[in-house]
């Protein structure tokens, strides 16, 4: 049987005077007269930390050789052996428990040097802000490791806005109202003590706690000026009218600070747009629609200012949306002169006789944009490529300088174009350009004539193409009617119209003879009008060698 007792040793003490701290003994030594030796294994002897204990193999005494540290090894479990001469166990190995008793040799240590937290201003009393934390290496659940927290200092120091639960490290708001606009942050110095928080001269660890006060929208934006004025020039667009300077005590740059404008009245016409400059918190009023001074001399409107963020419940009832009046004067800009229409049409006819030269065919009056009355202006021709007209420099009357000609190369689709410039007599000088479209009525003063009155064809050619033209326009031109005049007699038999197109015919020779013919045509336009002189086609039929053109006719030429 074994003889032993559990052992408890205090850390941090010189334990030599307590040696032997334990002794194992087997009574088999006496009973059987055996030579027994003792041996210990375990932490402190055969396992690290080595050299804590030594034993006497003959007596079984166990001595401690060094000061113990509970925080390093809180418990030693040794195994004792009783061995015979051969080294065999004579007893069942014995467990020896050595408990290391704690002393308060560790102070609390904060888990962070700086703790950071935040809480909204106006938070209710006893709102949990954050939790701080320290640890103590001494034995848990003892006074040695029981931590007590304390606020050492608070900056700003007064009033006391936070309290610290000494046991949990939780920081709460007090009944003092937090106001970010007064103090936007607080710095606390905290300490942690053990041993129930008694103040001793042992060193004490401290930490910093930084608490940021979060903004809420508890301030109403205020406009700098109660009366605002602006000025815009008429006919301008996308110009700044005025800036509304807003002051708001809430956090700069936040939605609680940022002004939000709405039109209260006066912008039903949609002339203005307002947006906030996020840098300056000014409301920028922009004119987005042209204003005519002659219609509106003033544009007064009002705006309401709030914040982008909703108001905090603490001020919601206090906010009264008060319209801010803005008076905008419209500045008259000299608009000078204008043509009521930049293009006018005048109708003339080719049938005008010589007496029509110098006749007034129209005018192109410029008007004053501001008054709407006829303007004092000087009228100048800008473009009149064939000098058809003259313009009275003062009255703008347009006179014919030459008779209209529908067939003129300057007439396009029946229209002759003139450009006239009006220059204001008043200052500032303004030049405007107008276009006069002179629409020329065509008369049937041209008859159809042959385009190619002299032609040569090869004797083996099936047909000859005969084409006419008439300089008149529709309906005084094509389609034409063609007929071969039977002069001399028999000619109409010899030359037959095989096919008729709008302005041409295919002519066929009934008997293929070489030589020259003079074929007379009667060609009438769409109105039945033909030239007084007959249209004669001089046609030479000749022999062509291998496509090389006419060989000199071997026969006498003949007519008809």
């Amino acid at each position: 049987a074994w003889i032993t007792a559990p052992v408890a040793l205090r850390e941090g003490e010189d334990l030599s005077k307590k040696n032997p701290i334990a002794k194992i003994h087997s009574d088999l030594a006496e009973e059987r007269g055996l030579k027994i030796t003792y041996k210990y294994t375990g932490k402190g002897i055969t396992e690290p930390p080595f050299g804590i204990f030594v034993f006497n193999k003959d007596t079984g005494e166990l001595n401690v050789t060094s000061i113990l540290d509970r925080e390093e090894t809180p418990f030693f479990l040794l195994t004792g052996y009783a061995l015979d001469a051969r080294g065999n166990n004579v007893e069942k190995p014995l467990e020896l428990r050595i408990k290391v008793l704690d002393i308060n040799d560790n102070e609390p240590v904060f888990t962070q040097d700086v703790f950071v937290g935040s809480v909204e201003e106006l938070s209710a009393a006893h709102t949990l802000v954050m939790k701080i934390n320290a640890t103590d290496a001494d034995e848990p659940n003892t006074l040695n490791s029981k931590i007590s927290y304390r606020i050492v200092s608070l900056e700003p120091a007064y009033p006391p806005v936070f309290y610290l639960n000494k046991d949990t490290g939780e920081i709460y708001t007090t009944s003092v109202t937090l106001d970010r606009e007064e103090h936007s942050s607080y710095t606390l110095t905290v300490e942690a003590r053990d041993g129930n928080g008694e103040v001793t001269d042992k060193p004490v660890k401290q930490a910093q706690v930084q608490i940021r006060i979060l903004d809420v929208n508890d301030n109403i934006p205020v406009v700098e000026n109660k009366v605002l004025e602006g000025m815009v020039e008429e006919n301008q667009v996308n110009v700044e009218v005025t800036r509304i300077k807003v002051f708001d005590a809430d956090e700069i740059g936040s939605d609680n600070w940022l002004a939000n404008f709405t039109f209260a009245s006066g912008n039903e016409g949609g002339y203005f747009h307002i947006e906030t400059d996020a840098q300056t918190n000014e409301g920028i009023v922009t004119l987005i629609k042209e204003v005519d001074y002659e219609e509106m001399k003033n544009l007064d409107f009002s705006v309401i200012v709030a914040n982008k963020a909703a108001f905090h419940k603490s001020i919601r009832s206090k906010y009264k949306p008060t319209p801010i009046p803005i008076k905008v004067k419209v500045k008259n800009v000299k608009e000078g002169i204008h043509f009521k229409s930049s293009v006018i049409s005048i109708y003339v006819s080719e049938s005008m006789d010589r007496s029509s030269k110098g006749q007034i065919i129209g005018n192109f009056q410029a008007f004053d944009e501001d008054t709407g009355l006829p303007a004092h202006a000087r009228y100048v021709k800008l473009e009149d490529r064939d000098n058809w007209i003259s313009v009275d420099s003062v009255t703008s009357e347009i006179k014919l300088a030459k008779l209209p000609d529908f067939e003129s190369r300057y007439v396009q689709n029946g229209t002759y174009t003139v450009k006239i410039v009006a220059i204001s007599e008043d200052y500032p000088r303004k030049t405007i350009t107008g276009t006069v479209l002179i629409n020329v009525e065509d008369i049937n003063d041209n008859c159809p004539t042959l385009i190619e009155p002299v032609q040569t064809i090869c004797h083996d050619a099936e047909y000859v193409n005969v084409t006419a033209e008439d300089l008149d326009g529709h309906p005084n031109s094509g389609p034409f009617s063609f007929s071969v005049i039977d002069k001399p007699p028999g000619m109409a038999e010899k030359w037959k119209i095989a096919r008729q197109e709008s302005t041409s015919v295919l002519l066929q020779q009934s008997e293929k003879k070489l030589g020259r013919s003079e074929i007379q045509f009667l060609i009438s336009d769409n109105q039945g009008f033909s030239c007084p002189e007959k249209q004669v086609l001089t046609l030479t039929v000749c022999e062509c060698l291998h496509g090389s053109g006419c060989r000199e006719a071997q026969h006498d030429s003949y007519v008809g």
């Epitope: 100048v380 021709k381 800008l382 003259s390 420099s393 220059i423 500032p428 303004k430």
Partner: antibody, heavy 118, light 106 residues
Framework: QVKLQESGPELVRPGESVKISCKGS????????MHWVKQSPAKTLEWLGV????????NYNQKFKGKATLTVDKSSSTAYMELARLTSEDSAIYYC???????????WGQGTSVTVSS | DIVMTQSPAIMSASPGEKVTMTCSAS?????MYWYQQKPGSSPRLLIY???NLASGVPVRFSGSGSGTSYSLTISRMEAEDAATYYC?????????FGAGTKLELK
């Protein structure tokens, strides 16, 4: 008193451009139009164009379209004429002239001599 | 373009003598302007709207005409009148000038 002060003489190479200035003083610069006239060595006068300063619109002689460009800087009361792609034909004295009452060219600058030579 | 033809190209007159020079337009014009230019100087407005004297112009100068035919007259020639005289129209763009009449002192 009304004065039109033109920039100094220019000697330029063929193919280059030149910008002549004409500073108006003694009157409301923006109220009037400014004309530009070329006087060739043969002493003939040719109209190049006009700019209505207040309204910033221009009219050019077709012959000089693409050759002359008229601009204005209202803040400095200065009218400009730029001549592009110069040739020896462009060597001349160039005048700016104010368009006054009755549409007459009532005040003229002292002229800027432009010589195009390689 | 309206072509302005001045005649004579060169003329001379004695002090006190009456001087007349003409300007003919290729198309009818409403008004005529006359300018005087002395060597080394810029042109100077003499007459606007055919017959009106510009500010500071002596009354011995006068202008007349209509349609295509216009003239400038100096009732009594003075030494300081020796210069080149240009007519100019502005009834049609571009503005055009005559080639000038050079008036010399005899």
């Amino acid at each position: 008193q009304v004065k039109l002060q033109e920039s100094g003489p220019e000697l330029v190479r063929p193919g280059e451009s030149v910008k002549i200035s004409c500073k108006g003083s003694g009157y409301t610069f923006t109220d009037y139009a400014m004309h530009w006239v070329k006087q060739s060595p043969a002493k003939t006068l040719e109209w190049l164009g006009v700019i209505s300063i207040y309204y910033d619109n221009t009219n050019y002689n077709q012959k000089f379209k693409g050759k002359a460009t008229l601009t204005v800087d209202k803040s400095s009361s200065t009218a400009y004429m730029e001549l592009a792609r110069l040739t020896s034909e462009d060597s001349a004295i160039y005048y700016c002239a104010r368009e006054g009452d009755y549409f007459a060219l009532d005040y003229w600058g002292q002229g800027t001599s432009v010589t195009v030579s390689s | 373009d309206i072509v302005m033809t001045q005649s004579p190209a060169i003329m001379s007159a004695s002090p006190g003598e009456k001087v007349t020079m003409t300007c003919s337009a290729s198309s009818s014009v409403s008004y005529m302007y006359w300018y005087q230019q002395k060597p080394g100087s810029s042109p100077r407005l003499l007459i606007y709207d055919t017959s009106n004297l510009a500010s500071g112009v002596p009354v011995r100068f006068s202008g007349s005409g209509s349609g295509t035919s216009y003239s400038l007259t100096i009732s009594r020639m003075e030494a300081e009148d020796a210069a080149t005289y240009y007519c100019q129209q502005w009834s049609s763009f571009p503005l055009t000038f005559g080639a000038g009449t050079k008036l010399e002192l005899k």
